[in-house]
Interface confidence: medium
C-alpha cells in the first residue's frame, strides 16, 4: 500500500523539514525561514511559534520542529505547551483571582506556582506526625505509636516551638 501510495503521490517522498511545492511540479522544497514541517509529505510548512512578551524561547524553531516557550523571570507556565504565563507566588501561597494568598491552615504549597494541598493525614496509614506541617511544607509521618515498643530505639520528636501548622514569620 505504501509503495502504491508513493507512486501515486510524489509528495509522500518529501521528508520533514520540506514541503511539497505545487508551484514547482511538486518538488520537495525546504521550509522557508521561521517555518517548519515535523512530518513528511506535507504540502505546507507551519509558521514557527514566536516566544514574545512574557514568553521566552526554551527551544529554537528548526525546519523540523516548532519552537518551545517558557516564561520570563518572575512568571511560570500554565497550560499545555506553556500556552500562558502567570506571576509567581511565594512558597506557602496560591494564586487566586485577588492575587497571591497564604495557604489555609492544614494546607501547604512548596512551590511558587500551583495550589495549596492538604497536609498528609498520617493516621490514614496508621502512622503518627513526626514533624508538623507548615504553609510551605507537608507534615512528616513517623512510625505508628504501636511500633514504638518500650526499649526500642527511636527518635523522639522535639517539642513544637510554635503552634502546629504555622510557619515562623
Amino acid at each position: 500500500f505504501e509503495r502504491t501510495r508513493s507512486l501515486q503521490d510524489p509528495c509522500s517522498n518529501c521528508p520533514a523539514g520540506t514541503f511539497c511545492d505545487n508551484n514547482r511540479n511538486q518538488i520537495c522544497s525546504p521550509c522557508p525561514p521561521n517555518s517548519f514541517s515535523s512530518a513528511g509529505g506535507q504540502r505546507t510548512c507551519d509558521i514557527c511559534r514566536q516566544c514574545k512578551g512574557v514568553f521566552r524561547t526554551r527551544k529554537e524553531c528548526s525546519s523540523t520542529s516548532n519552537a518551545e516557550c517558557d516564561c520570563t523571570p518572575g512568571f511560570h507556565c500554565l497550560g499545555a505547551g506553556c500556552s500562558m504565563c502567570e506571576q509567581d507566588c511565594k512558597q506557602g501561597q496560591e494564586l487566586t483571582k485577588k492575587g497571591c494568598k497564604d495557604c489555609c491552615f492544614g494546607t501547604f504549597n512548596d512551590q511558587k506556582r500551583g495550589i495549596c494541598r492538604p497536609w498528609t493525614n498520617c493516621s490514614l496509614d496508621g502512622k503518627s506526625v513526626l514533624v508538623n506541617g507548615t504553609k510551605e511544607r507537608d507534615v512528616v509521618c513517623g512510625p505508628s505509636p504501636a511500633d514504638l515498643s518500650p526499649g526500642a530505639s527511636s527518635v523522639t520528636p522535639p517539642a513544637p516551638a510554635r503552634e502546629p501548622g504555622h510557619s515562623p514569620q
Epitope: 516566544c51 521566552r56 509567581d88 501561597q93 494564586l95 485577588k98 492575587g99
Partner: antibody, heavy 118, light 107 residues
Framework: QVQLQESGPGLVKPSETLSITCTVS????????VHWVRQPPGKGLEWLGV???????DYNPSLKSRVTISKDTSKNQVSFKLSSLTAADTAIYYC????????????WGQGTLVTVSS | DIQMTQSPSSLSASVGDRVTITCRAS??????VAWYQQKPGKAPKALIY???YRDSGVPSRFSGSGSGTDFTLTISSLQPEDFATYYC?????????FGGGTKVEIK
C-alpha cells in the same frame, strides 16, 4: 493614572542602611510587581531587584546580601533597604512597575537622589 | 550575567534624520529586549518591549528589531523631543541588565 513616588533620606553615612519607600497609586500591588533600579550621577542604569505581586523577591546577585525589598499592600507601599553603604552607592534610586506582559518596567517613579557621605 | 553592549555611546543628528542605535547581547536572549528613553533630570520611559512591540502611546517613528544577540532601535525621523539617552535592557534571565546608553545630541 498610574503613579509611583519614591521618598528617601537624601543623605546617609557610610556603613549605615538606606531605606526608601515607594508609594504607588492607580494600580494594585496585589496584581503588579515593582522593580528597583539605580543610576549613579552621570552613569547608566543598574537593576537592583523586584518584588512580585505575591511577595516573592528576586535580587541582583551583586548586591543580594545587602538588599531587602518588602511591601505593605494595604498601604500601597514598597520598601527598599540597602545595608553597609559606601560612596559607590550614591545614586538616584527609582522604583518602577512591572506590567503583566513582560519582565520590564512600564511606569517609573521620578527617582530620589541618595548621597552617601560622612 | 548577560552583558548588553550599546553602540554608539553618543551621536549627533539633526531634526528629520533617521537614527539607528544597536545593542548586542553577550548571549542569546531571544526577543526579550526592551528599550527606554531618558531625558536629563527625568526617569526613564518605556518605548519598546519584546524587541519590536511599541509601548502604548509611543509614536510610530520609534521601531525596534532583532533577535538572538543583535538588536536595533530606529527613529525614522528625529523630532526635537527625541534628543535624549536611550537604553536597551534584556529580561531573558536574571539579573536583568541594561546597556550603557546612547546619547542622541543635536548636531
Amino acid at each position: 493614572q498610574v503613579q509611583l513616588q519614591e521618598s528617601g533620606p537624601g543623605l546617609v553615612k557610610p556603613s549605615e542602611t538606606l531605606s526608601i519607600t515607594c508609594t504607588v497609586s492607580g494600580f494594585s500591588l496585589i496584581s503588579y510587581g515593582v522593580h528597583w533600579v539605580r543610576q549613579p550621577p552621570g552613569k547608566g542604569l543598574e537593576w537592583l531587584g523586584v518584588i512580585w505581586s505575591g511577595g516573592s523577591t528576586d535580587y541582583n546577585p551583586s548586591l543580594k546580601s545587602r538588599v531587602t525589598i518588602s511591601k505593605d499592600t494595604s498601604k500601597n507601599q514598597v520598601s527598599f533597604k540597602l545595608s553597609s553603604l559606601t560612596a559607590a552607592d550614591t545614586a538616584i534610586y527609582y522604583c518602577a512597575r512591572n506590567p503583566l506582559t513582560a519582565t520590564v518596567m512600564d511606569y517609573w517613579g521620578q527617582g530620589t537622589l541618595v548621597t552617601v557621605s560622612s | 550575567d548577560i552583558q548588553m553592549t550599546q553602540s554608539p555611546s553618543s551621536l549627533s543628528a539633526s531634526v528629520g534624520d533617521r537614527v539607528t542605535i544597536t545593542c548586542r547581547a553577550s548571549q542569546n536572549v531571544g526577543t526579550n529586549v526592551a528599550w527606554y528613553q531618558q531625558k536629563p533630570g527625568k526617569a526613564p520611559k518605556a518605548l519598546i518591549y519584546s524587541a519590536s512591540y511599541r509601548d502604548s502611546g509611543v509614536p510610530s517613528r520609534f521601531s525596534g528589531s532583532g533577535s538572538g544577540t543583535d538588536f536595533t532601535l530606529t527613529i525614522s525621523s528625529l523630532q526635537p523631543e527625541d534628543f535624549a539617552t536611550y537604553y536597551c535592557q534584556q529580561y531573558n534571565s536574571y539579573p536583568l541588565t541594561f546597556g550603557g546608553g546612547t546619547k542622541v545630541e543635536i548636531k
